[in-house]
Interface confidence: medium
Amino acid sequence: PEPPTACREKQYLINSQCCSLCQPGQKLVSDCTEFTETECLPCGESEFLDTWNRETHCHQHKYCDPNLGLRVQQKGTSETDTICTCEEGWHCTSEACESCVLHRSCSPGFGVKQIATGVSDTICEPCPVGFFSNVSSAFEKCHPWTSCETKDLVVQQAGTNKTDVVCGPQDRLRA
């Protein structure tokens, strides 16, 4: 019979022959022959391969370097890499999470829309009309202006996105 030019899924062509790929978590030791199956071996303790493969070496698990503020979010297996995240108070600088930076603060006039996590920075939003923030914070939202009416007072100074309104007593009309 004619030697194959293409192989089925999870197979590879070598020496005019279709051999089985090694399953995830295993590496190739020797190709199949006319008489023997592909020989595979499990990856070592701190290694992995995440696809059907013909790799002769497994990949090393990622190291979450505590000196860069990293910690293990999910321990690697023979089939998956280790996932790193940042220590509390810090977040990843990239999707690969190779280092961490401190969460940023929202400036006055802006409030926190979403508190930062290990993988995302603080999300700030401008304080809309009726709200203000006079602080620099990674935690505080915009606060509503004080309602002078509910205190039986009147607005003496309008609020801004950075300042609260100033309330004062109502002018009494003399009889």
């Epitope: 940023r104 603060s105 400036s107 914070s137």
Partner: nanobody
Framework: EVQLLESGGGLVQPGGSLRLSCAAS????????MIWVRQAPGKGLEWVSA????????YYADSVKGRFTISRDNSKNTLYLQMNSLRAEDTAVYYC????????????RGQGTLVTVSS
């Protein structure tokens, strides 16, 4: 000029307590979050705790939760860290810091105060 000056460090036995202080000047202290970070010998910086400008929001790393308490006195421009049930692994230089507006490491941090937990 922004200045942060830590004090209160020292040698303490495991299980003991210390209270760190940080005197701030050169900026409007009451309008900023403040944080404590620490650096153990040969290690990187570790975030310890944070407090919101008015002191109502406090946040802690898992490693110190339930043992450390952060507080502030805006009338005195001072930040505090009460450390109880101290462990050997708490040994480090402790810094108070003003967090960044952008993604730099810190806007400012102090010179630090050394806490040594040993019997």
């Amino acid at each position: 000029e922004v200045q942060l000056l830590e004090s209160g460090g020292g040698l303490v036995q495991p299980g003991g307590s210390l209270r760190l202080s940080c005197a701030a000047s050169g900026f409007t202290f009451s309008t900023y979050d403040m944080i404590w970070v620490r650096q153990a010998p040969g290690k990187g910086l570790e975030w310890v705790s944070a407090i919101s400008p008015n002191g109502t929001g406090t946040y802690y790393a898992d490693s110190v939760k339930g043992r450390f308490t952060i507080s502030r006195d805006n009338s005195k421009n001072t930040l505090y860290l009460q450390m109880n049930s101290l462990r050997a692994e708490d040994t480090a230089v402790y810094y108070c810091a003003k967090p960044p507006q952008v993604n730099t490491e810190f806007d400012y941090r102090g010179q630090g105060t050394l806490v040594t937990v040993s019997s």
